[in-house]
Interface confidence: medium
């Protein structure tokens, strides 16, 4: 793997910026000289800089007073592409007095533990020794961008280098790009791309379906404003820089439309006056749907064609259709909408409903006690049912017992072919009512109006029917 | 890493071949191949441009139109289409991959400007 | 569209010289340069990238430079190996409009 070189600087340094080979990174200090106390920064000429000297205190001979600690200055800033090596140091020349002289390096603030390659090597000489401390990173990424220092303490003092700015250079990387969208037809939009190097600049070119849209660059971030599209569209965006140029990912604009009609309308269950349906929404055309409409026609020729239509929410995909007739044939379909407007109807589907109940209650009915059997004799005629009722199939009856405070109902099926019934006597000297429903597959039609008679005790008897009058005989 | 090329040969002028580069050892999606000829005793000219992953295809201004570049992802293969050969259409025809980018994320195409892999060409000679 | 122009066309040095050649662009392409070298009958080889990058297994006797519209390849202590055409390569453009650009080469002869 070749080792990556500082390049020179494209605008101009950084603080402590100096452009030197490799070479001179690793060089050892050829004299065992101290740094001077009072030194020039190379960023601002001409100014005394002292910001990482440490003063050391006297010597134990109590007559020497030691120069100033300070590193010796180093490449200030190396840049260097994606996946390359690198391998940087610090040197300072300690003398022989100090022990256990430690360097720590520093990555932005933080301190540097843990598996990284850093070497301190040690070069002792007759007064001072040497120490040139290492850092090498294999295959540098992004994250590796920094500001790196030494660090050396000693006699608690700290000693600081100067930083080491390290600028790792790939493709542009991107922040933003643009998303997928879907849009009304001929209504401007915009789509927003950004990327990042180093290196900067990063230019900006747009794609639309393969072909560039802007002939001139834009820098990062780029805001691409579209006046309108008529039909579907792929957009990306190209981010430039001196390394080359990475393309997004491509991103569709779809055009909003109103939705295709709804499939596989079911029917779940039928009732004499209501139908539960269920649909698959059609393709929502990009654009989320809004509500539904029920579409409910009767299947009659003696019928107007007049279409009932019932509004519905979008979700759930089912509606119990309601207030429709016993025993009918209806032509159902489904329409649904979003803000386009309205798709076109479903494949309309057949379905009926079950037979009623009654609509009206037995008529003429009488009641009498026949007390030599101890029963009570019911009779009445048999409704006028409508066609939708459908077919009678029998009567359910009705009769109450009263007596001081007492109450009981009991409950009599009887076939439809009966027009007349006897019951027990339940209790002496207490008032029966009597009512009276009609029963078809369809369930139990209205009771008839109740009609009362009273049991007297035993051995009083009144023979005397009592009736609920007939329609128009009242 | 190779890339070798194949389908060269002699033809008349009017004629078509098709050309093919496969790639072994290499994630052939995540890099862009380029066609890049040679007449004898000239320099060289980059034709067309091919990135299997994404589908991005770019042709030089002297071809466009009439040469097709194409992959076969499964395979590891770029193909070059050359339909109508003329005479100036005679030279070594080199596949070459972009430099490698092992940073990119994926779902995005990186192309990195340079060729740092070359098969070693195949000759077409196209006589009039 | 920019227009890569090579000087000189051919040159000739001794072994242990050096050889410089130059690149010039019609219009500013920043770093985006590359040298690649040629032998007879074999692919180029790429030598430099964006400019003053070497390649991977390349000697550092290969050092690249300039950027914008000026660019210089210089090969210093020359051997017998370094006889061959020397070419340099931009890219332009987009990713589905761009151009990879070829100057017309530079033959170096080794004495």
């Known amino acids: 793997r070749e080792e990556a070189k500082p390049y020179p600087l494209f605008p101009g340094p950084l603080p402590g910026s100096l452009q030197t080979d490799h070479t001179s990174l690793l060089s050892l200090p050829h004299t065992s000289g101290y740094q001077p106390a009072l030194m020039f920064s190379p960023t601002q000429p001409g100014r005394p800089y002292t910001g990482n000297v440490a003063i050391p205190r006297v010597t134990s001979a109590g007559s020497k007073l030691l120069p100033p600690l300070a590193f010796k200055h180093t490449v200030g800033h190396i840049i260097l592409s994606e996946h390359k090596d690198v391998k940087f140091n610090c040197s300072i020349s300690v003398p022989n007095i100090y022990q256990d002289t430690t360097i720590s390096w520093w990555k932005d603030g933080k301190e540097l533990l843990g598996a990284h390659h850093a070497i301190t090597q040690f070069y002792p000489d007759d007064e001072v020794t040497a120490i040139i401390a290492s850092f090498s990173i294999t295959s540098v990424q992004r994250s590796d961008n920094g500001s790196y220092i030494c660090k050396m303490k000693i006699n608690n003092e700290e000693i600081v280098s100067d930083p080491i700015y390290i600028e790792v250079q790939g493709l542009p990387h991107f922040t933003k790009q643009p998303e997928s969208m879907n849009v009304t037809r001929n209504t401007a939009f915009n789509l927003t791309c950004q990327a990042v190097g180093p290196p900067e600049p990063v230019n900006i070119f747009w794609v639309q379906n393969s072909s560039r849209v802007n002939e001139q660059p834009e820098k990062s971030p780029s805001v691409l404003t579209v006046p309108g599209l008529t039909e579907m569209a792929v957009f990306s965006c190209e981010a430039h820089n001196d390394k080359g140029l990475t393309v997004s990912k491509g991103v569709q604009i779809n055009i909003k439309a109103i939705p295709s009609p709804p499939t596989e309308v079911s029917i779940h269950n039928s009732t004499a006056h209501s139908i539960l349906i269920s649909w698959v929404p059609g393709f929502d055309g990009y654009s989320p749907f809004r509500n539904c409409s029920v579409q409910v026609k009767e299947v009659d020729p003696l019928s107007n064609g007049s279409v009932m239509i019932f509004n519905t929410s979008a979700s759930p995909h089912m509606y119990q259709i309601k207030q429709l007739q016993a025993l009918a044939n209806y032509s159902i379909g489904v329409s649904c909408m979003n803000e386009i407007g309205w798709s076109a109807v479903s494949p309309w589907i057949l379905a009926s409903t079950t037979e009623g109940a009654p609509s009206v209650a037995p008529l003429n009915v009488t009641v009498f006690l026949n007390e030599s059997r101890d029963n009570v004799d019911i009779r009445w005629m048999k409704p006028l049912t409508k066609r939708q009722a459908g077919e009678l199939v029998g009567y359910r009856i009705s009769h109450v017992w009263q007596s001081a405070g007492i109450s009981k109902e009991l409950l009599e099926e009887v076939g439809q072919n009966n027009s007349r019934a006897q019951i027990s006597v339940q209790v002496h000297n207490a008032t029966c009512t009597v009512r009276i429903a009609a029963v078809t597959k369809g369930g139990v039609g209205p009771f008839s109006d109740p009609v009362k008679i009273f049991i007297p005790a035993h051995g009083w008897v009144d023979h005397a029917p009592s009736s609920t009058p007939a329609p128009g005989n009242a | 890493q190779e890339l070798v090329e194949s389908g060269g040969g002699l033809v008349q002028a009017g004629e078509s071949l098709k050309l093919s580069c496969k790639a072994s050892g290499i994630d052939f999606s995540s890099y862009g191949i380029s066609w890049v000829r040679q007449a004898p005793g000239k320099g060289l000219e980059w034709i067309a441009y091919i990135y299997p992953g994404f589908g991005i295809t770019n042709y030089a201004h002297s071809v466009k139109g009439r040469f097709t570049i194409s992959s076969d992802n499964a395979q590891n293969t770029v193909f070059l289409q050359m339909p109508s050969l003329t005479a100036s259409d005679t030279a070594t025809y080199f596949c070459?991959?972009?430099?490698?980018?092992?940073?990119?994320?994926?779902?995005?195409?990186?192309?990195?400007?340079?060729?740092?892999?070359w098969g070693p060409g195949t000759l077409v000679t196209v006589s009039s | 569209d920019p227009v890569l122009t090579q000087t000189p066309s051919s040159v000739e040095a001794a072994v242990g010289g050096t050889v410089t050649i130059k690149c010039q662009a019609s219009?500013?392409?920043?770093?985006?340069l590359a040298w690649y070298q040629q032998k007879p009958g074999q692919p180029p080889k790429l030598l430099i990238y964006s400019a003053s990058t070497l390649a991977s297994g390349v000697s550092s006797r290969f050092k690249g430079s300039g950027s914008g519209t000026e660019f210089t390849l210089t090969i210093s202590d020359l051997e017998c190996a370094d006889a061959a055409t020397y070419y340099c390569?931009?890219?332009?453009?987009?990713?589905?409009?761009?151009?990879?650009?070829f100057g017309g080469g530079t033959e170096v002869v080794v004495k």
């Open positions: 070459a991959r972009d430099l490698d980018y092992t940073g990119g994320v994926v779902g995005y195409a990186y192309v990195t400007y340079y060729f740092t892999l």
């Open positions: 390569q931009t890219y332009y453009g987009g990713s589905t409009t761009g151009w990879y650009v």
């Open positions: 219009e500013s392409i920043s770093s985006r």
